[in-house]
């Protein structure tokens, strides 16, 4: 598949030179689509173009992150006179065209959503053959993936002066609130770190000093649910044993 880099022509495509106002290039996408992790989501995208009876070869493309330059997650091509768009790329096999590009519909279905899919997506169509033309959505559609909390790591680590500290990291969207409970603790929010740069769905809470042996439980909760995990601290001659 030849991908042209001359996308500067997009501005020309919106001018009177190309077509009457009723048949300009345009793309219609919603600002945002929300879905839960593990489910499927549909990213709607329809378009208008000035070549009303175009029957030549076409390519439909979806990319993630940024328009024009972001990585492609889906691509299909339809031959002249065909309504069958043959998939050439579907990242991890999770992207499937729902719409019919011949009928101005590039809507995409994303299966088995993960929090990592939470980003902006951009649809694009390219005509080849008699007509060489292309258009891509500038603003795209934001896929907002929500998820119940999941504790991804819980551990006990040594700290200075023969003490121990506990770390709990959880992911979820909205980012979960974390709380520790354990011997002589009651319920403690402990030191909760803000979501880390580039890891917007991860939250970490630290118990800086574990003073008693026993079971320490981390609970993560958001509007979609809660999750908990425990570690055990046993001190034998200055050593620790931890299990979850």
């Amino acid at each position: 598949f030849v991908r042209t880099k001359i996308d500067t022509t997009e501005n020309l495509l919106n001018t009177e030179v190309h077509s009457s106002p009723a048949q300009r290039w345009s793309m219609q996408v919603p600002p945002e689509v929300s879905a839960e992790a593990g489910d499927a989501a549909v990213l709607p995208c329809t378009f208008t173009h000035p070549h009303r009876h175009y029957d030549g070869p076409l390519t439909a493309i979806w990319r993630a992150g940024e328009p024009y330059a972001g990585p492609q997650v889906f691509r299909c091509a339809a031959a002249r006179g065909s309504e069958l768009c043959q998939t050439a790329l579907s990242l991890h096999g999770r992207f499937r065209l729902l719409g019919n590009p011949r009928r101005n519909d590039l809507s995409l279905r994303v299966e088995r959503l993960a929090l990592a899919d939470d980003r902006r997506y951009f649809c694009r169509v390219e005509f080849a053959g008699d007509v060489h033309d292309r258009y891509e959505s500038r603003h795209g559609v934001r896929l907002h993936v929500t998820a119940a909390p999941r504790i991804v790591n819980i551990s006990v680590l040594p700290s200075p002066a023969h003490a121990f500290r506990a770390l709990c990291t959880a992911e979820g969207e909205p980012p979960p609130a974390l709380a520790w409970s354990g011997p002589a603790l009651g319920n403690s929010l402990a030191a909760v770190r803000s979501p880390r740069e580039g890891h917007g769905h991860l939250v970490t809470a630290e118990l800086p000093a574990l003073t008693h042996d026993g079971r320490y439980t981390c609970t993560a909760a958001n509007s979609l649910g809660r999750s908990e995990a425990s570690v055990y601290l046993f001190r034998f001659h200055g050593a620790s044993g931890a299990s979850t």
């Epitope: 048949q23 329809t46 006179g81 065909s82 309504e83 069958l84 043959q86 998939t87 009928r103």
Partner: antibody, heavy 116, light 112 residues
Framework: QVQLKQSGAELVKPGASVKISCKAS????????VNWVKQRPGQGLEWIGK????????YYNEKFKGKATLTADKSSSTAYMQLSSLTSEDSAVYFC?????????WGQGTLVTVSA | DIVMTQAAPSVPVTPGESVSISCRSS???????????LYWFLQRPGQSPQLLIY???NLASGVPDRFGGSGSGTAFTLRISRVEAEDVGFYYC?????????FGGGTRLEIK
């Protein structure tokens, strides 16, 4: 030139199954849907469904779900339709059609006769 | 399902004259993209159907320009000018806007 060549006439017993074929030539088989159409003797045309060879795209007329099963073999550029639990109502000529706009070329038809 | 109706079961015509065959749909076949998803087919006696017109008014490859299609969203006409003996057979309209695709009952063109 584009051609769709269908398998020969079939005489089958009630309750049995039959599989008819449609071999395409003269174009890239995987680029176009293959449609299947039923025509009972002296009657009109009825769309059964269509398959996109080499893709997961299969569409059925609800009326024929459970009756017709569409498959395709890319390596031989052949589409197949299996008809199951046959009754006298299934006695008909079955056509495949493909290429531009889905219906630009038609096979010569396969006559299926269901009779005890 | 969209119902396609061809009211006239048969239309007699004299060779050299013009004739119109009509078809109606229970729902508009005009898509938001401006195209009208209607086909016209001719099935000559003992033969397979042949595509004449696609998207209501576009002549299929190899079809003589004596054939023409027109219409609105729900009412369609196939016009044949200078009818020839080889034009006899059944003419079917078909919608492919929505699944399942549906055909009209057919109109038989016969020579007077």
């Amino acid at each position: 030139q584009v051609q769709l060549k269908q398998s020969g006439a079939e005489l089958v017993k009630p309750g049995a199954s039959v599989k008819i074929s449609c071999k395409a030539s003269g174009y890239i088989f995987t680029d176009y849907y293959v449609n299947w159409v039923k025509q009972r003797p002296g009657q009109g045309l009825e769309w059964i469904g269509k398959i996109g060879p080499g893709s997961v795209s299969i569409y059925y007329n609800e009326k024929f779900k459970g009756k017709a099963t569409l498959t395709a073999d890319k390596s031989s550029s052949t589409a197949y339709m299996q008809l199951s639990s046959l009754t006298s109502e299934d006695s008909a000529v079955y056509f495949c059609a493909s290429y531009y706009y889905g219906f630009a070329y038609w096979g010569q038809g396969t006559l299926v006769t269901v009779s005890a | 399902d969209i119902v396609m109706t061809q009211a006239a079961p048969s239309v007699p015509v004299t060779p050299g004259e013009s004739v119109s065959i009509s078809c109606r749909s229970s729902k508009s076949l005009l898509h938001s993209n401006g195209n009208t998803y209607l086909y016209w087919f001719l099935q000559r006696p003992g033969q397979s159907p042949q595509l004449l017109i696609y998207r209501m008014s576009n002549l299929a490859s190899g079809v003589p320009d004596r054939f023409g299609g027109s219409g609105s969203g729900t009412a369609f006409t196939l016009r044949i000018s200078r009818v020839e003996a080889e034009d006899v057979g059944f003419y079917y309209c078909m919608q492919h806007l929505e699944y399942p695709y549906t055909f009209g009952g057919g109109t038989r063109l016969e020579i007077k």
